[in-house]
Interface confidence: low
């Protein structure tokens, strides 16, 4: 509830004698603030006695009348010095001065806090001529005052290049407290202290602050604004606000939520974007971050084959861009993939596991133990080998590709043979005698052709030679294949 202090009016004439004009407010300004402690505003309306000399700027005219009487000093008459009123009320205040009729074209300007109020639509100047002097009354009115109307107002008049300045009229607009700093939403670590700040201003001052947590006041005593609330720590989310009180009532700040940082929720919607023989590209939708930014994520990969040893491969990556290419996978294999992400508090649970498969690839190794020998009786070269290990076939074998290159003086001829996957031997016709035949073999799957084996060379003699020993791939460590004839 907003409490509005009762306003009292004590109007009195501003201009003694024949001059019209008095202080006017639509609802009359607050002249005294009722308060049990006896507080009264420091500055009150203080009318002066008629004829009291002016303390501000005066102009002493040099002109004298026909009788050579010197004219009295020109000065604005005293008026109210301090007007206190509530926001949105109306106020009217005046400056008055009596100017000898010998002066023409006198104008009064209004100034606020040292700046002229140009074209101020609320200013009216009235002239009341008499035999010798003209009473000039400048009125300034504001229909609905706001805080921005607070300040010091003066009148100025120029005569004979002299400036006459009135005493200031201080306008003090009072209202409910106005927040200059409100608490901010925060994400905090459980059971860790943090501060919230609240600041509000009047007038009227003082402004007292009460803190509210989840609709209950926190501090037993009101604190003068500004106030810093140190919360020793929270175990669950809370909403804080502050109440600012002054003699006009109370204003409540926005409520701010203080969240407790927690481990994130697991990622959701892990999906396969692309699959190759040895890699899988996945993406995921991050879960709730637990009021703390994600730092990184962990991709966990395990073979789905029930016969596998169940070991888990872990790949760490940055939290963004929620995309990761898992590499070094086996071809034509099934994997279970889960994703977990972490923030400063800890790791989330693993996402629901998804199944993914790599595609068939070209074999990663060549056939082993390639042996070549010449069968002269049939004029053929016999080739034998061992198939690559199953794990390194990277797919289902569909056959082999044999490259045989024939070289003799000035001639080089390469031929390719495709053989079926059954068996591990082949026979090729001798293409050239008195030449060297170099043989290489590669395994083939639907995924492509694998690497060729190291070359094995055999010399094919001219007709009539008797004894031929086989050639084979070298034992590990030998630099070149050995040709035995």
């Amino acid at each position: 509830a907003i409490t509005e202090a009762r306003e009292e009016a004590k109007p009195y004439p501003l201009f003694p004698g024949p001059f019209p004009g008095s202080l006017q407010t639509d609802h009359t300004p607050l002249l005294s603030l009722p308060h049990a402690s006896g507080y009264q505003p420091a500055l009150m309306f203080s009318p002066t006695q008629p004829g009291r000399p002016h303390t501000g700027n005066v102009a002493i005219p040099q002109v004298t009348s026909v009788e050579s009487k010197p004219l009295p000093p020109l000065a604005f008459k005293h008026t109210v010095g301090h007007i206190i009123l509530s926001e949105h009320k109306g106020v009217k205040f005046n400056c008055s001065i009596s100017v000898p009729n010998i002066y023409q074209d006198t104008t009064i300007s209004w100034w606020k806090d040292g700046k002229e109020l140009l074209g101020a639509h609320h200013a009216i100047t009235q002239f009341y001529p008499d035999d010798e002097v003209t009473a000039i009354i400048a009125s300034f009115s504001i229909t609905s005052v706001q805080r921005s109307d607070n300040g010091s107002y003066i009148c100025k008049m120029k005569i004979n290049n002299e400036e006459i300045v009135s005493d200031p009229i201080y306008i003090e607009v009072q209202g409910l407290p106005h927040f200059t700093k409100q608490p901010e939403s925060m994400n905090v670590t459980r059971n860790t202290a943090f501060n919230l700040t609240c600041q509000a201003v009047g007038p009227p001052e003082p402004v007292n602050i009460f803190w509210v947590q989840n609709s209950s006041r926190v501090n037993e005593q009101p604190e003068k604004s500004p106030s810093v609330l140190t919360v020793p720590g929270l175990t669950e989310m809370a909403v804080f606000s502050c109440e600012a009180h002054n003699d006009k009532g109370l204003t409540v700040s926005k409520g701010v939520q203080i969240n407790i940082k927690a481990i994130p929720s697991p990622p959701t919607e892990v999906s396969i974007r692309n699959s190759t023989a040895h890699s899988i590209l996945i993406s995921w939708v991050p879960g709730f971050d637990g009021y703390s930014p994600f730092r990184n994520c962990s991709i966990q990969v395990k073979e789905a084959d029930p016969l596998s040893n169940g070991s888990v491969m872990i790949f760490n990556t940055s939290a963004l861009p929620h995309l990761y290419q898992i590499k070094q996978l086996q071809a034509l294999a099934n994997y279970s993939i889960g994703v977990s992400c972490m923030n400063e508090i800890g790791w989330s649970a693993v996402s629901p596991w998804i199944l993914a498969s790599t595609t068939e690839g070209a074999p990663s190794v060549a056939p082993l133990n390639v042996t070549v020998f010449l069968n002269e009786s049939s004029d053929n070269v016999d080739i034998r080998w061992m198939k690559p290990p199953t794990k390194q076939q990277d797919g289902e074998l569909v056959g082999y590709r044999i490259s045989h290159v024939w070289q003799s003086a000035g001639i080089s001829k390469e031929l390719l043979e495709e053989v079926g996957q059954n068996g591990s031997r082949a026979r090729i016709s001798v293409q050239v005698h008195n030449a060297t035949c170099t043989v290489r073999i590669a395994a083939v799957t639907r995924g492509g052709v694998g690497p060729f084996s190291d070359p094995v060379k055999i010399f094919i003699p001219a007709h009539g030679w008797v004894d031929y020993a086989p050639s084979s791939t070298p034992a590990p460590g030998n630099a070149d294949p050995v040709l035995i004839i």
Epitope: A36, Q213, S216
Partner: antibody, heavy 124, light 107 residues
């Protein structure tokens, strides 16, 4: 059911001591501020002091009339609030009530649950 | 300390009547005021808090109003169970203080 039951009242000579107890049940005793209020015969209620909750370290606050003579304490494991009264005077006579601040209410506080009261008479 | 002044100190009324008890604070306490009812030989019971919010289980014939320094408790259509003493209490800051009480008697 939320319940507060005071005990320990009786007749004591001026200058003497007395300890009152307030057994709490039906709510989480450690979460609430707890207070003592007294009522002299035929007179108004007077707040004596309170014990803040566990989150605020069970710290205490006293009225000027009893500060230095009365001490409020708690046994949180038994859910009992105590009022230790020393240097008793005739004007300390009356019915003593323990009362509970509303849950999670940390202000000067109103009292939503009251005990049945126990009578203290200080007389020679 | 903030002084709470209750009036009247006592009043007589008949069943079915409407009565109003007032409470004045020595300074602005905004809406931080509670009302209690106490029957003879019993402990006080909370009726109203935050100046106008009825406590749980309090009949709607009770109503609180006011803010700042002036507060009142109104009881419409008095019932036999309503007779007893009534106290106001501020909780704007420590120490919380009670009014002197109003004794409501059957006429």
């Amino acid at each position: 059911e939320v319940k507060l039951v005071e005990s320990g009242g009786g007749l004591v000579q001026p200058g003497g001591s007395l300890s009152l107890s307030c057994a709490a049940s039906g709510f989480t005793f450690t979460d609430n501020y707890m207070t003592w209020v007294r009522q002299p015969p035929g007179k108004a209620l007077e707040w004596l002091g309170f014990s803040r909750n566990k989150a605020n370290g069970y710290t205490t606050e006293y009225s000027a009339s009893v500060k230095g003579r009365f001490t409020i304490s708690r046994d949180s494991s038994q859910s009992i609030l105590y009022l230790q009264m020393n240097a008793l005077r005739a004007e300390d006579s009356g019915t003593y009530y323990c009362a509970r601040f509303p849950p999670h209410y940390y202000a000067g506080g109103y009292f939503d649950v009251w005990g049945t009261g126990t009578t203290v008479t200080v007389s020679s | 300390d903030i002084q709470m002044t209750q009036s009247p100190a006592s009043l007589s009324a008949s069943v079915g009547e409407t009565v109003t008890i007032t409470c004045r604070a020595s300074e602005n306490i905004y809406s931080y005021l509670a009302w209690y009812q106490q029957k003879q030989g019993k402990s006080p019971q909370l009726l109203v808090y935050n100046a106008k919010t009825l406590a749980e289980g309090v009949p709607s014939r009770f109503s609180g109003s006011g803010s700042g320094t002036q507060f009142s408790l109104k009881i419409n259509s008095l019932q036999p169970a309503d007779f007893g003493s009534y106290y106001c209490q501020h909780y704007y800051r420590t120490p919380p203080t009670f009014g002197g009480g109003t004794k409501l008697e059957i006429k």
